[in-house]
Amino acid sequence: NKILVKQSPMLVAYDNAVNLSCKYSYNLFSREFRASLHKGLDSAVEVCVVYGNYSQQLQVYSKTGFNCDGKLGNESVTFYLQNLYVNQTDIYFCKIEVMYPPPYLDNEKSNGTIIHVKGKHLCPSPLFPGPSKP
């Protein structure tokens, strides 16, 4: 009785931002749920949390300093992470808990998504070349 989660094996975060879609083998319509994204092989860092229920708007927050937003589909939650640093390149795992109605359900651990954060390369702009030499 575990929800299955599908994630892309790898994503590259250009411009230090990425959309990570967590697809569930379960329809979240009419449920209260807590979807979360965890960083690291041991899932030690809870990057972002999305609370969903049918009476309020999605509640999205991070207690670990990540800039994140969330979007809900019938069988998916997409996490939008911004302002990522190169050293935050890691494996990220989606987690889902259906809190209501009973019975409580959660997911089998997914394979995770490696997010590779590419640093911004600050190149001199061709519009403003340096002083020309005679």
Epitope: N1, I3, E32, S55, Y100, P101, P102, P103
Partner: antibody, heavy 118, light 112 residues
Framework: EVQLQQSGPELEKPGASVKMSCKAS????????MNWVKQSNGKSLEWIGI????????TYNQRFKGKATLTVDKSSSTAYMQLKSLTSEDSAVYYC???????????WGQGISVTVSS | DVVVTQTPLSLPVSFGDQVSISCRSS???????????LSWYLHKPGQSPQLLIY???NRFSGVPDRFSGSGSGTDFTLKISTIKPEDLGVYYC?????????FGSGTTLELK
């Protein structure tokens, strides 16, 4: 139109088991959990348990653990409840009821009368 | 288990009356999401219970606006503004927040 069609009345001997059904139509069966409720003669309603039809996961009222077993058949959009080791205390009307929004049972079956008598 | 106390047990009425039924729970029915799962049902003789009000105050589809629900925490009320013949029967409240879910003992609305 949402409908829950329950099987017919049952007359059983003490110690026997009975399995009753609740066929759902008019909605996506796996999107809503199904409750079962007991009403003994002249008494209030009593919640037996709930099943998630997608996975078949269940939660029971402690009072009915070991007495009631909830199952589903997704292919026929049917929920089942089996009662075992029947006694006269199990004589009652049993309802299936869909769990809608906000923890409410929004659609109910017509009820199944179970009589346990020797 | 959460005990749900419904009062009165019996309510003799005349058509056109306005009545209130009270439902009290032994603990708050607000969950961690801020939702309160309290609903009201009418059970007419020979029929199945029918949902009237869900989430304290939301009328279910097809339910006339003479039915209204209110309350919070542990105290809830169902009001019927103008009693009609089809309103006679047994009214139940249900708390769906804490397991096991529990019904009130019922209020019988009957003619004086």
């Amino acid at each position: 139109e949402v409908q829950l069609q329950q099987s017919g009345p049952e007359l059983e001997k003490p110690g026997a088991s009975v399995k009753m059904s609740c066929k759902a139509s008019g909605y996506s069966f796996t999107d809503y959990n199904m409750n079962w409720v007991k009403q003994s003669n002249g008494k209030s309603l009593e919640w037996i348990g709930i099943i998630d039809p997608y996975y078949g996961a269940t939660t029971y009222n402690q009072r009915f653990k070991g007495k009631a077993t909830l199952t589903v058949d997704k292919s026929s959009s049917t929920a089942y409840m089996q009662l075992k080791s029947l006694t006269s205390e199990d004589s009652a009307v049993y309802y299936c009821a869909r769990f809608g929004f906000y923890g409410a049972m929004d659609y109910w079956g017509q009820g199944i009368s179970v009589t346990v008598s020797s | 288990d959460v005990v749900v106390t419904q009062t009165p047990l019996s309510l003799p009425v005349s058509f056109g009356d306005q009545v209130s039924i009270s439902c009290r729970s032994s603990q708050s029915l607000a969950n961690s999401f801020g939702n309160t799962y309290l609903s009201w049902y009418l059970h007419k003789p020979g029929q199945s219970p029918q949902l009237l009000i869900y989430g304290i105050s939301n009328r279910f589809s097809g339910v006339p606006d003479r039915f209204s629900g209110s309350g919070s925490g542990t105290d809830f009320t169902l009001k019927i503004s103008t009693i009609k013949p089809e309103d006679l029967g047994v009214y139940y409240c249900l708390q769906g927040t804490h397991q096991p879910f529990t019904f009130g003992s019922g209020t019988t609305l009957e003619l004086k």
